[in-house]
């Protein structure tokens, strides 16, 4: 999906009002400097691409974050403020339902959410170019 035509300010507002709190809640108990920042993004569409990937794509050691509160709110924000986004996600959602597993917070998931916090932080930067 190409995030170029999203309403970035509305997504930013959704992040600041709710998603950020849910990320904080998920990370509760984690040490500030436990994880290094290794994922970056250069502009807002790129940040959303990386955020979508880390939030919804299973990775080794972290099977799924998609059912977490921050992920559901991220999905809702993208569906509302990115034209055509929800249509592209229908097949992906059906595939995910088939492989849904018991929710376990692993250290790898915490590291991944730490990276997500960094990506969202970059997305919110006022001078970050859109293109």
């Amino acid at each position: 999906y190409d995030f170029t035509n999203c309403d970035f300010e509305k997504i930013k507002a959704a992040y600041l009002s709710t998603i950020s709190k849910d990320l904080i809640t998920y990370m509760s108990g984690t040490k500030s400097t436990e994880f290094n920042n290794t994922v970056s993004c250069s502009n807002r569409p790129h940040c959303l691409t990386e955020i979508q990937s880390l939030t919804f794509n299973p990775t080794a050691g972290c099977a799924s974050l998609a059912k977490e509160m921050f992920a559901m709110k991220t999905k809702a924000a993208l569906a509302i403020w990115c034209p055509g986004y929800s249509e592209t996600q229908i097949n992906a959602t059906q595939a995910m339902k088939k492989r849904r597993k018991r929710k376990v917070t692993t250290n790898k998931c915490l590291e991944q959410v730490s990276q997500l916090q960094g990506l969202w932080r970059r997305f919110n930067r006022p001078l970050l170019k859109q293109q």
């Epitope: 809640t25 509760s28 108990g29 500030s32 970056s40």
Partner: antibody, heavy 118, light 107 residues
Framework: QVQLVQSGAESKKPGASVKVSCKAS????????MHWVRQAPGQCLEWMGE????????DYNQNFRGRVTITVDMSASTAYMELSSLRSEDTATYYC???????????WGQGTTVTVSS | DIQMTQSPSFLSASVGDRVTITCKAS??????VAWYQQKPGKAPKLLIY???MRHTGVPSRFSGSGSGTEFTLTISSLQPEDFATYFC?????????FGCGTKLEIK
């Protein structure tokens, strides 16, 4: 282990600028955010701003915006905080402090006292 | 910005006493609150993070609790080295803000 070593005390006249340094060691400099916090005598701690050394992006407390500039020298693993248009109420101890993506401060510099007086 | 209102500002107590310091946030900060101890001429030292988690090396007599808008730091049995100033800080949202401190003095 992580260490943050700050430059020495400064005395300045009103209207001048001051630049305080914070040399970091014991970790990869680009991995974490560097913040500056100040404490005026008998006053609250006040967060001034932060820098991401990986790309030098800064965020500032609006109370200081326009007067404070935070920079880094990657080759020296050193962060700097410059405060301009000094006034007497800027007399304070200035601290650098380190965080990851979660913003509580588990590592602090020893502090630099800045005195502003005519 | 979120305001952190700390009370009391001053507290007199004796060695062995149990003391409680309170911090109230002007809006919900979940559990994103840290507590610091500061001695004269020194940098603050982290005691508690995530409202209730003790930092490495912090004695078990220090404990934190709370969520949402009300938080407490408790020292179960004061030791001579505990007489200092204590600050709370919220890191739930930008800009990060501190309470104005509680100075704990020997009675």
């Amino acid at each position: 282990q992580v260490q943050l070593v700050q430059s020495g005390a400064e005395s300045k006249k009103p209207g001048a600028s001051v630049k305080v340094s914070c040399k970091a060691s014991g970790y990869t400099f680009t991995s974490y955010l560097m913040h500056w916090v100040r404490q005026a005598p008998g006053q609250c701690l006040e967060w001034m701003g932060e820098i991401d050394p990986s790309d030098s992006y800064t965020d500032y407390n609006q109370n200081f915006r326009g007067r404070v500039t935070i920079t880094v020298d990657m080759s020296a693993s050193t962060a700097y905080m410059e405060l301009s248009s000094l006034r007497s109420e800027d007399t304070a101890t200035y601290y650098c402090a380190l965080t990851g993506t979660i913003n509580y401060f588990d590592y602090w510099g020893q502090g630099t006292t800045v005195t502003v007086s005519s | 910005d979120i305001q952190m209102t700390q009370s009391p500002s001053f507290l007199s107590a004796s060695v062995g006493d149990r003391v409680t310091i309170t911090c109230k946030a002007s809006q919900d900060v979940v559990t994103a609150v840290a507590w610091y101890q500061q001695k004269p001429g020194k940098a603050p030292k982290l005691l508690i993070y995530w409202a209730s988690m003790r930092h490495t090396g912090v004695p078990s007599r220090f404990s934190g609790s709370g969520s949402g808008t009300e938080f407490t730091l408790t020292i179960s049995s004061l030791q001579p080295e505990d007489f200092a100033t204590y600050f709370c800080q919220q890191y739930s949202s930008f800009t990060f803000t501190f309470g104005c401190g509680t100075k704990l003095e020997i009675k």
